[in-house]
């Protein structure tokens, strides 16, 4: 999917005001420096394609995160504020039901979600003259 | 616990340059915009431009872009701004500042200040 | 560039009175619904101090006695009731529009 034609500064409010809690809550009680950051984007659409990518697609030892609140609302926000996302995505919801797993949250997860807090960042103020 | 560790005073002639330096730790130093802001007592706080760690990409306010120059060292996680050609009109506290956790665009972390004082 | 203007430059209130804080921006820094203005505390020789950021919410370690309000262009920045500590130079903030700007500062005295 192509993010170019996104919504941003909406997709930045539903963020700020919702997405952002929940993913504090999914790493409460974890150091923010326990991490070493190695996904980086350098653009709003770059970004959002690195956000969808650890949020929905299933790495070896985090197979789980599709599920979490944050995803949810991700996919919402995504699907309200990029045109056709919605559509691009019922094939990828379909497969995802198949490989259902028991949640657990992993050292991997945990490390994920601490790449999506640089990546959500990152979207939110770009050094750009993006606002 | 952030903590930004700023470089110490500085006395400089006017037209020298100044090179300051600002080390972070407590936090991933690379996936934060880190700014520099300068204070003066009559002028208040000025915005100088910031830095993005994580690839060096900068903005800068138009007032200082000719003269400022910021750089990182993602190593040492350090930032640097150098400032060109002063004049006594840049005697001030410059501070380096970490943007918050979320991209709202404040500042919740600051370094102490480096004093700089620009005199013949 | 939006300009923010800060009234009064200055003001001194009796202890345990309320202290009011005007910013006004030369144009909205509202965004979808937000409102991206902050406001900073800075006392002599220390840095300044986050107190409040998007408007209203209250920045990590800040007493209730500090409040926000406003939108669009209008903000307030209310100190009920006012502290010994609390003298020093109060600063609102945008980030809707590059470049970041402050407002030149209210520096709020005892009476």
């Known amino acids: 999917y192509d993010f170019t034609n996104c919504d941003f500064e909406k997709i930045k409010a539903a963020y700020l005001s919702t997405i952002s809690k929940d993913l504090i809550t999914y790493m409460s009680g974890t150091k923010s420096t326990e991490f070493n950051n190695t996904v980086s984007c350098s653009n709003r659409p770059h970004c959002l394609t690195e956000i969808q990518s650890l949020t929905f697609n299933p790495t070896a030892g985090c197979a789980s995160l599709a599920k979490e609140m944050f995803a949810m609302k991700t996919k919402a926000a995504l699907a309200i504020w990029c045109p056709g996302y919605s559509e691009t995505q019922i094939n990828a919801t379909q497969a995802m039901k198949k490989r259902r797993k028991r949640k657990v949250t992993t050292n991997k997860c945990l490390e994920q979600v601490s790449q999506l807090q640089g990546l959500w960042r990152r979207f939110n103020r770009p050094l750009l003259k993006q606002q | 616990q952030a903590y930004l560790q700023q470089s110490g005073a500085e006395l400089v002639r006017p037209g020298a340059s100044v090179k300051m330096s600002c080390k972070a730790s407590?936090?991933?130093?690379?996936?934060?915009?880190m700014h520099w802001v300068k204070h003066t007592p009559g002028q208040g706080l000025e915005w100088i431009g910031a830095i993005y760690p994580g690839n060096g990409e900068t903005s800068y306010n138009q007032k200082f872009k000719d003269r400022a120059t910021l750089t990182v060292d993602k190593s040492s996680r350090t930032a640097y701004m150098q400032l060109s050609s002063l004049t006594s009109e840049d005697s001030a506290v410059y501070f380096c500042?970490?943007?918050?956790?979320?991209?709202?665009?404040?500042?919740?972390?600051w370094g102490a200040g480096t004093t700089v004082t620009v005199s013949s | 560039d939006i300009v923010l203007t800060q009234s009064p430059a200055s003001l001194a209130v009796s202890l345990g009175q309320r202290a009011t804080i005007s910013c006004r921006a030369s144009?909205?820094?509202?965004?979808?619904?937000?409102?991206?203005m902050h406001w900073y505390q800075q006392k002599p020789g220390q840095p300044p101090r986050l107190l409040l950021y998007?408007?209203?919410n209250l920045g990590s370690g800040i007493p209730a006695r500090f409040s926000g309000s406003g939108s669009g262009t209008d903000f307030t920045l209310t100190l009920n009731p006012v502290e010994t500590d609390d003298v020093a130079t109060y600063y609102c903030q945008q980030i809707n529009t590059d470049p970041l700007t402050f407002g030149a500062g209210t520096k709020l005295e005892l009476k």
């Open positions: 500042a970490r943007e918050d956790d979320y991209g709202e665009g404040y500042f919740d972390v």
């Open positions: 144009e909205s820094v509202d965004n979808s619904g937000l409102s991206f």
């Open positions: 407590g936090f991933a130093f690379t996936t934060y915009n």
């Open positions: 998007r408007a209203s």
